[in-house]
Interface confidence: low
């Protein structure tokens, strides 16, 4: 997508002003263009930094200008670099003294892998010295002084990519400033081939265009454009779309154009010579005047454009009859488009003859990404390419370019895309009032995040049920009434804002939950849940006297806390209890009930109970004896839930007395966890046991606890917390 061009004016430096201009045509770089010395090509050239300035005549161009007094510091190799999406495109060129002892035949030479190549330098000064040839600054070849020919040549019978580089020639007594340079570019592939494996056939690039070995595209010489470089530009214009213009009195005279490899450097069409200041001879045209006109039907030959065909004829030699080719034109593309973030399908529409094909239309994002059409159609007069961006975001805002490149020429149209953030309310809607079948809502649509203006608002609502789909109503006011709701149902609410344009529906805002009022009967009163046995619980309630004549029944739902086990039981309305059976011993159950007619009633609060135990209870835990005085002591303990413990027994006796002389204290309230023993003898050791009883029997104490009362004079410590029986 980057059309980078380096203009070297003039490559042979005398005492006149000389310059390098680097132009990024039809492309807006995010990173600046740089011009620098190419030390890769020539290590030992001048080290001075370059004074790079903005070219005032062009938006995206940089320039280095050397005044005549700096002529001695100019010799060397240079580059211009542009970056797009992190990928660098570098164009190389050279400048040398016009007074050098040798001059190259051409500034650059592009050959295919395997070609038989002669790199030649013309001798312009005769000296009694050996001639030497260097490649990238390293010596490769010398010619004895008596054998230096008029044309000094380096012969490469089978050129390989590693042969590429800057070749220089001079006399041995000379230096960098008397050297002549030429750059050999060796395409990675053999003639007419491209691709990673060089197994694709190149498009026929006309008018001395060069096939790029990585993309298969033609790099067109200055003055030609289109997919095959067949289309000549208007006079004195250049660039991929012929939009750039040479401003000199004689057009592009004295401009050497350097393009990305493997093109190298050449004159613009109509000019030749190392300085591009010689016009083509009659019958020749094109870059470096290398193309010969052989126009059919006696048509005119123009040194810039080649054969000028009469209407109805076309081709390089006007050899084909047919409709005249028409450079493509991009139509119906506004300069500015506002887009909502999300999916975006931009359309590029173009005319021309032949009509552009799917492959010939592309869309370039501001970051340089090239998109190809996802869909394509055409009418008699237009081709329409539809592109798909699955998720366009605000950072994608900027200048996009629709590009069309056919055999009839190339055109690019930049347009500005402004990506908007979809609006989303910051607050959840508020519920002002509810009934059993309606709710009054304040939709709280402002403030919102994202871009306006808001075109419409939707209130979305649904029951909080795994399978219910969202329903919505369009709203214009901030206060809205939702009707036809289900009673005793929890609903979710949220607001969706819509801004203008396609895909303007924002993400729904925060969710508010509310529950509609009940119209069912109230739950049974006086509910009581008690264990009956190891496998049954008994649920009882007060008699129900409904106000209407409708048949009714009690629905009881029980579920196990420990297991995924749930059961619903229907009980006739005239009963006041139900035995829940087939339960598991020592398991906790949650039960609730409601009174149903045709409409379902309101559920009661949850009741919880354990079935009776099927094993002896475990010993009370955390047994502590504290607050000991001369005649009393406090015993505390904890018991485990779920073992149907009905009572706690404390057994104590004076140590050493017979077993049958013990005292038993039975505590029938199992929620009590503390007891004060009284009437004890001072300074006496007691043996204390504590055990729990349930429906199966008593727990087995593991060991006894010892308690020694204090002498009569000592004061007791503070009393501990907990429920206590005195």
């Amino acid at each position: 997508a980057m059309d980078l061009i380096l203009i070297n004016s003039l490559p042979l430096v005398s005492d006149a002003e000389t310059s390098l201009t680097c132009i990024a045509s039809g492309w807006r770089p995010h990173e600046p263009i740089t011009i620098g010395r190419d030390f890769e090509a020539l290590m030992n050239q001048h080290q001075d930094p370059l004074e790079v300035t903005q070219d005032v005549t062009r938006e995206w161009a940089k320039k280095v200008v050397w005044k005549r007094e700096k002529a001695s510091k100019i010799n060397g190799a240079y580059f211009c670099e542009g970056r797009v999406r992190g990928e660098a495109i570098r164009i190389r060129t050279m400048k040398m003294r016009q007074q050098a002892s040798f001059l190259p035949a051409t500034l650059t030479m592009t050959v295919d892998k395997g070609d038989n190549v002669n790199i030649s330098f013309k001798k312009v000064l005769i000296k009694e010295e050996d001639a030497v040839i260097y490649k990238n600054g390293s010596f490769i070849h010398s010619v004895p002084r008596h054998e230096v020919p008029d044309i000094l040549e380096v012969h490469l019978p089978h050129a390989q990519p590693q042969d590429a580089g800057v070749y220089s020639a001079r006399y041995i007594g000379g230096n960098l400033f008397t050297s002549a340079f030429t750059r050999l570019i060796v395409r990675r592939c053999e003639a007419q081939k491209w691709g990673p494996e060089c197994n694709h056939l190149c498009t026929a690039c006309m008018n001395n265009g060069v096939c790029h070995e990585d993309t298969g595209e033609c790099i067109c010489p200055p003055g030609f454009m289109g997919r095959t470089c067949e289309k000549a530009c208007e006079l004195h214009t250049f660039g991929r779309t012929c939009k750039e213009r040479c401003s000199g009195q004689e057009g592009c005279k004295s401009y050497v154009f350097c393009l990305p490899d493997p093109y190298g450097c050449s004159c613009a069409t109509g000019w030749k010579g190392l300085q591009c200041n010689e016009a083509c001879h009659p019958g020749f045209y094109g870059p470096d005047c290398k193309l010969r006109c052989s126009c059919n039907n006696g048509e005119m030959c123009d040194r810039f454009q080649g054969c000028l065909c009469s209407p109805g004829w076309q081709g390089l030699q006007c050899e084909r009859e047919g409709i005249q080719r028409m450079t493509p034109k991009i139509v119906d593309l506004p300069d500015h488009i506002e887009v909502n973030s999300g999916k975006f399908n931009p359309i590029c529409k173009a005319s021309g003859w032949p009509l552009p094909t799917n492959e010939e239309m592309t869309l370039v994002k501001p970051d340089g990404t090239v998109l190809h059409p996802k869909d394509f159609n055409h009418t008699d007069h237009f081709s329409v390419a539809i592109f798909t961006i699955h998720r366009i975001l605000p950072p994608d805002s900027g200048v996009w370019v629709c590009s069309v490149n056919t055999v009839a020429g190339m055109v690019e149209k930049p347009f500005n895309i402004s990506v908007k953030v979809l609006p989303k309310p910051l607050n959840a809607p508020n519920v002002i009032d509810t009934g059993h079948n309606f709710a009054v809502i304040n939709i709280s649509s402002e403030p919102y995040f994202g871009d306006g203006p808001i075109k419409s608002k939707k209130l979305l609502y649904k029951p909080v049920n795994h399978y219910e789909a969202w329903q919505h109503i369009q709203v214009t006011n901030e206060i809205v009434t939702l009707n036809y709701l289900e009673p005793r149902t929890e609903y979710e609410l949220c607001v969706q804002l819509v801004r203008r344009g396609e895909g303007g529906e924002g993400h729904p805002g925060p969710v508010r939950r509310f529950t509609t009022a009940s119209i069912g009967l109230p739950p049974p009163r006086g509910l009581n849940l008690l264990p009956k046995s190891q496998t049954t619980l008994n649920l009882t309630w007060q008699p129900i006297f409904p106000s209407s004549e409708d048949d009714f029944y009690v629905e009881v739902e029980r579920r196990s806390v420990q297991k995924s086990d749930q059961q619903n039981i229907k009980v006739p309305g005239n009963l006041t209890s139900v035995l829940l059976n087939n339960l598991h011993p020592r398991e906790q159950y949650v039960v609730r009930a409601r009174v149903n007619t045709k409409a379902q009633g309101e559920w009661s609060e949850d009741l919880t109970a354990w079935t009776l135990s099927d094993i002896l209870p475990p010993q009370p835990e955390n047994i502590k004896i504290s607050n000991i005085t001369h005649s009393s002591a406090v015993i505390s303990w904890t018991i485990l839930d779920g073992y149907s413990i009905s009572s706690i027994t404390i057994r104590y006796k004076v140590q050493g007395k017979n077993e049958d002389q013990h005292v038993d204290v039975k505590i029938k309230n199992a929620t009590i966890t503390q007891y004060q023993l009284k009437g004890l003898e001072p300074e006496t050791a007691y043996q204390v046991d504590i055990f729990a009883e349930n429906n199966i029997g008593s727990s087995n104490p593991a060991f006894s606890h010892e308690l020694v009362t204090l002498p009569e004079s000592q004061a007791p410590a503070d009393l501990g917390g907990g429920k206590m029986l005195l």
Epitope: P463, V464, N465, H466, Y467, E468, A469, E486, E557, S564
Partner: antibody, heavy 122, light 108 residues
């Protein structure tokens, strides 16, 4: 004890309709979501349709959308699947399955019927 | 649509040995995963829900683990009645509910 019994399967030609039924017992039918799940011969399980306890909300897999309709009659404790425009690829055993959650549908199935075979062939 | 991928397709195990079945989700499903057992000619039977909870009446040799995208069903010591096809099912996204392709556990 929860029981689900499917009926209505059989052999039909492509394009013809068929209606499956599932009789439910042993639980409060109108509080549970119900689904149809099918299994082509020798293949895995594919969820087809779901209906909420009240019958107010339904959802279908894309493969049957517009052709199949799920419904229920809570007074008869019966679930239905109306299948129109049947295709050869609809050949399968159709199971009716009870959602495990009562108060809110959970999306997995604690009880399944034994299934009814639907064969679509020309 | 959330895609569930079960591996291996077939698992050959000797009675008494441990079996480990895997289920991978194409996106995060938290713990919303169930496992079912299906024997030839029978309907599927719920074994595990919420990735690690055993359904009522399921022996404790069956256990489930995992969350997010990687889940495992482990049968600690295979009994003869455990040889069957096992399916995982996600219910994080019910549009649609989806099942894995199944793992067949066969006698080695």
């Amino acid at each position: 004890d929860v029981q689900l019994v499917e009926s209505g399967g059989g052999e039909v030609r492509p394009g013809e309709p068929l209606r499956l039924s599932c009789a439910a017992s042993g639980f409060t039918f109108n509080t549970y979501g119900m689904s149809w799940v099918r299994q082509a011969p020798g293949e895995g399980l594919e969820w087809v349709s779901v209906i909420s306890g009240s019958g107010g909300s339904t959802y279908h897999a894309d493969s049957v959308k517009g052709r199949f309709t799920i419904s229920r009659d809570n007074s008869k404790n019966t679930l239905y699947l109306q299948m129109n425009s049947l295709r050869v690829e609809d050949t399968a055993i159709y199971y009716c399955a009870k959602d495990s959650g009562s108060w809110t549908s959970s999306g997995f199935f604690d009880y399944w019927g034994l299934g009814t075979l639907v064969t679509v062939s020309s | 649509e959330i895609v569930l991928t079960q591996s291996p397709g077939t698992l050959s195990v000797s009675p008494g040995e441990k079996a480990t079945l895997n289920c991978r989700a194409s996106q995060n499903i938290n713990s919303k995963l169930a496992w079912y057992q299906q024997k030839p000619g029978q309907a599927p039977r719920l074994l595990i829900y919420d990735a690690g909870n055993r359904a009522a009446g399921i022996p404790d040799r069956f256990s489930g683990s995992g969350s997010g995208t990687e889940f495992t069903l482990t049968i600690s010591s295979l009994q003869s009645e455990d040889f069957a096809v096992y399916y995982c099912q996600q219910y994080y996204d019910w549009r649609p509910l989806t099942f894995g392709g199944g793992t067949k556990v066969e006698i080695k």
